[in-house]
């Protein structure tokens, strides 16, 4: 008949498993339970995936690996006494008197429960990496952490190459023995030890459990170090940069840590496993029963098969590893799990021209000299789209793309952003807001929803802020409804009249040129160059200023560039920016200075795009270390990442305007990076490409 093969990871666990199997058989519990011996939790997961075993209890990190790499699912969860249902919370604690926040942890002294432990290491380190605060190069998490904090106590890190930094705050026992041991010999080991490290002033932040402070303050601790401590003298660091009282851990934590859970193959009936274990716990979880499911004392060990602190086992409703782990823990694990042995030795960068090949070659050499990992290789392609194809086909790994190309890369080729560019504020031509400008007019005020029948001014046909974004946005919002993909006719019928300068006016609706004025002699009307006085962003604004149009679609800088004395041409010399307003998507109007909150879309910065199976944290980790050395255009290290002047080109590999590469943070998809408004505008336009 049916049997469930439990995987044990050690001799004591195999012993307990045998006893549990025997106890279940005696009690007539079906199906029968067998025990399979694995060498480790990882090995057991492989055995289950290979159908040589069926079930094992795993911690959060192992559940993540088992689910992501082997398709296993959690079906039964542990519940613990004194805990919050099937989970507890990982928190960061600081002294109330300090000024530390989650954003200022760089350089502070840190206290950890132990190396590779969930709340003391995995969650905080994973969270800092995933949120972009801590960059890791070449999967060397230990080095990254040792560089990031200003000294730490991480019990168990004494065997690593970075013990000087990671064990700097550890003190051992009263006689100085066992410094940095992952055992009670180290006074700063475990939850209470990490908190003690903070309380005694050795460290500035402690990564512990939600209950640790309350269990070790206000007279609850017998040891002398904790007797005078008050919980009110400590605070929690929240992910949004604020701080909170130590009792506020439900709202202010780094992650909710899931309980251990029993995992099985996707094709295994989770209900069957729960019924088996439920029968078992009903009979064998109380004191005095012949077999104790939730005790390991008889075997001289702890936490065999199940955690000893388990009070009951419960069925898991949504049997996916993502749902069980929760998004906070899941995100932290994404940041942490980086196997140096599985890290490709090379990052193959896509290049599109001879100057770009030259710069990429120099970048590869410069990075290699500084021992940056992974090493850069340069691979040619014919076009951005060809790059996308080659990345998808795993012939190349990365390329920097503009907004429209990011959209195609994400939507058509499944690529994701790994890092982004950031430009100085003066560089508003590289990333800017698209705005709808109107005259401030209280008597004839209209909103974005009331544009039908108005007169419109556009920089030119196909210009991002003058045409693509506003028209795309109006299509997406359902105001303009093209028939048979004829956008031009639809726009010409939506507005009463327009000026949309164009280079090829064949089959061009006359109303799209109706407001155009041409040059001083009235010639070259509606041409797509500066001979048409209403051409370009400046011209579109002039069209509004001179009352030819009611709305101008321009960049957020356009009004400022042509008012308050910034443009001395006669038409602009006396203009004041206060006389103009923006139309907002929510139906309101706003001051022209409020462009960041009132716009049709932001033209996004360029981003480095990769396959979704590429570890984005290693890509950003490489670029971040590289920009420390090569990012400043005045560096003396022999290569300039964000300057192309040595190669007789512009914007090679990265835009020259880039002042730094930034992590993507929560913008981990092409939609997230581009922003909903920009995507909506592109989708509005692309829906018409028949």
């Amino acid at each position: 008949g049916m049997e469930v093969r439990w995987c044990a990871t050690s001799d004591p666990e195999q012993h307990k498993c045998g006893n549990m199997s025997e106890a279940f058989r005696e009690a007539g519990i079906q199906p029968s339970l067998l025990c399979v011996r694995g060498t480790s939790a990882d090995h057991c997961v492989q055995l289950i995936a290979a159908q040589e075993a069926d079930a094992i209890t795993l911690d959060g990190g192992a559940i993540y690996e088992a689910g992501k790499e082997h398709g296993l699912k959690p079906v039964v969860g542990e519940v613990y006494d004194q805990e919050v249902g099937t989970s507890y919370y990982a928190v960061a604690v600081v002294r109330r008197s300090s000024h530390v926040t989650i954003d200022t942890l760089k350089g502070v002294k840190s206290c950890h429960t132990g190396i590779n432990r969930t709340v003391g290491w995995n969650v905080p380190v994973g969270y800092l990496v995933e949120s972009g605060r801590l960059s890791v190069m070449g999967c060397d998490v230990l080095k990254a952490v040792s560089d990031y904090f200003g000294g730490s106590c991480v019990p168990g890190a004494g065997e690593t190459s970075y013990s000087e930094s990671l064990c700097r705050l550890c003190r051992g026992d009263s006689s100085g023995e066992g410094v940095c041991d992952k055992s009670p010999l180290e006074r700063y080991y475990d939850y209470s030890g990490a908190f003690r490290c903070l309380a005694e002033g050795a460290g500035d932040v402690a990564f512990v459990k939600h209950s640790t402070v309350l269990e070790n303050t206000d007279g609850k601790t017998l040891p002398s170090w904790g007797q005078a401590l008050l919980s009110q003298d400590f605070e929690l660091l929240c992910r949004d940069g604020s701080r909170a009282d130590v009792t506020e851990w439900r709202q202010c934590h780094l992650a909710r840590v899931p309980a251990h859970a029993v995992v099985v193959r996707a094709d295994t009936d989770g209900g069957l496993i729960f019924r088996l274990l439920n029968e078992g716990q009903r009979l064998f979880s109380h004191e005095g029963s012949s077999f104790q499911m939730f005790s390991s004392e008889a075997y001289g060990q702890k936490d065999l098969l199940f955690k000893d602190s388990t009070s009951e086992l419960v069925p898991i409703a949504t049997q996916t590893y993502e749902a069980w782990l929760g998004h906070e823990y899941l995100h932290a694990m994404k940041g942490l799990l980086c196997d140096p042995n599985r890290l490709p030795p090379y990052l193959r960068w896509c290049v599109l021209s001879t100057p770009e090949i030259q710069k990429c070659g120099d970048m590869a050499v410069a990075f290699r000299r500084q021992r940056l990992k992974p090493e850069i290789q340069c691979v040619s392609a014919k076009s951005p789209q060809h790059c996308m194809e080659r990345i998808q086909a795993e012939q190349v790994d990365a390329v920097t793309l503009s907004g429209e190309d990011i959209y195609t890369a994400g939507k058509t080729y499944g690529l994701v952003p790994a890092a982004g560019e950031h430009y100085a504020p003066e560089d508003s031509s590289n990333s800017y807001y698209v705005v709808a400008v109107v005259r401030r007019d209280s008597s004839h005020a209209f909103t974005l929803d009331e544009l039908r029948g108005k007169r419109s001014c556009h920089a030119g046909f196909g210009s991002p802020a003058g045409w693509d974004v506003p028209v795309g946005a109006l299509i997406q919002r359902g105001f303009i409804r093209p028939k048979d993909c004829d956008v031009l006719t639809a726009v010409s019928e939506f507005f009463n009249a327009s000026c949309v300068p164009v280079n090829n006016p064949k089959n061009y609706p006359s109303s799209l040129c109706a407001l155009c004025v041409g040059d001083e002699q009235g010639r070259n009307k509606c041409v797509g160059n500066s001979q048409e006085r209403y051409y370009g962003y400046r011209g579109a604004f002039r069209c509004l200023v001179e009352n030819a149009g009611d709305v101008a679609f321009v960049r957020h800088t356009t009004v400022f560039d042509n008012t308050n004395g910034h443009n001395s041409e006669p038409w602009a010399a006396e203009l004041r920016s206060e006389d103009y307003e923006l139309l907002c998507p929510n139906g309101a109007r706003a001051e022209v200075s409020q462009f960041a909150a009132c716009n049709l879309a932001q033209i996004p910065p360029h981003a480095v795009m990769v396959r979704p199976d590429t570890n984005i944290f290693t890509v950003y980790g490489l670029l971040d270390k590289a920009q420390d050395l090569f990012g400043d255009d005045h560096n003396k290290n022999g290569f300039k990442m964000f300057d192309s002047s040595n190669y007789h080109g512009q914007d090679l590999l990265f835009k020259d305007a880039t002042v730094r590469a930034v992590p993507v943070g929560e913008k981990t998809t092409y939609r997230g990076w581009l922003g909903l408004d920009y995507v909506a505008a592109l989708e509005g336009m692309s829906s018409q490409q028949c």
Partner: antibody, heavy 119, light 112 residues
């Protein structure tokens, strides 16, 4: 009217961390760029860095390994942390705003706070 | 970094006189977008710097029209047509065309 006010300790010990707060009234730190500048004895001004409306930071490369600028939008405050200070960091520290209206010149400054690094 | 050199270091003037301060950049301050991000500040004794002129020649709100800025490329000038007592202090030029922004060393305007 836009006003910025710096606050923080006037004396910091060498190797410690200098922490300053800039409290802003009359404008929201969720628009524009919010900067730190310092002035050394003898009048030399040095630009330190900014935090943008979207929370992105830029730091002067000469300070990059030691500086951190953060913000708390709920309090309309932003902060400067400078680690491992030495006597060379003795200066008057200013916070200032940059917006498009003046093409990102620093149009409003705090009154400054004098910081001495000494044991 | 881009070096901004101001001359003179000190400028003694009589009230009512014209004053002229020069600022020279080590490289052109014309940005790729065509703008020139050269600004002038005045720091009165015991106060913080205040913006006078932005983008070469634009007076900030509230700044009297006796202040004017000019120049292009690498050479820029601030002129005060008739110096008043409230104009005394240290004048700084600053560029933000290139990152990081940099300041000149200052010119002290004082009474003769």
């Amino acid at each position: 009217e836009v006003q910025l006010q710096e606050s923080g300790p006037s004396l910091v010990k060498p190797s410690q961390t200098l922490s300053l707060t800039c409290s802003v009234t009359g404008d929201s730190i969720t628009s524009g760029y919010w900067n730190w500048i310092r002035q050394f004895p003898g009048n030399k001004l040095e630009y330190m860095g900014y935090i943008s409306d979207s929370g992105i930071t830029y730091y002067n490369p000469s300070l990059k390994s030691r500086i951190s600028i953060t913000r708390d939008t709920s309090k309309n405050q932003y902060y400067l942390q400078l680690n491992s200070v030495t006597a060379e960091d003795t200066a008057t520290y200013y916070c200032a705003r940059r917006t498009l209206a003046t093409y990102y010149a620093m149009d409003y400054w705090g009154q400054g706070t004098s910081v001495t690094v000494s044991s | 970094d881009f070096v901004m050199t101001q001359t003179p270091l000190s400028l003694p003037v009589s009230l009512g006189d014209q004053a002229s301060i020069s600022c020279r950049a080590s490289q052109s301050l014309v940005h790729s977008n065509g703008n020139t991000y050269l600004h002038w500040y005045l720091q009165k004794p015991g106060q913080s710097p205040k913006l006078l002129i932005y983008r070469v020649s634009n007076r900030f709100s509230g700044v009297p029209d006796r202040f004017s800025g000019s120049g292009s490329g690498t050479d820029f000038t601030l002129k005060i047509s008739r110096v008043e007592a409230e104009d005394l202090g240290v004048y700084f030029c600053s560029q933000s065309t290139h990152v990081p922004p940099t300041f000149g060393g200052g010119t002290k305007l004082e009474i003769k």
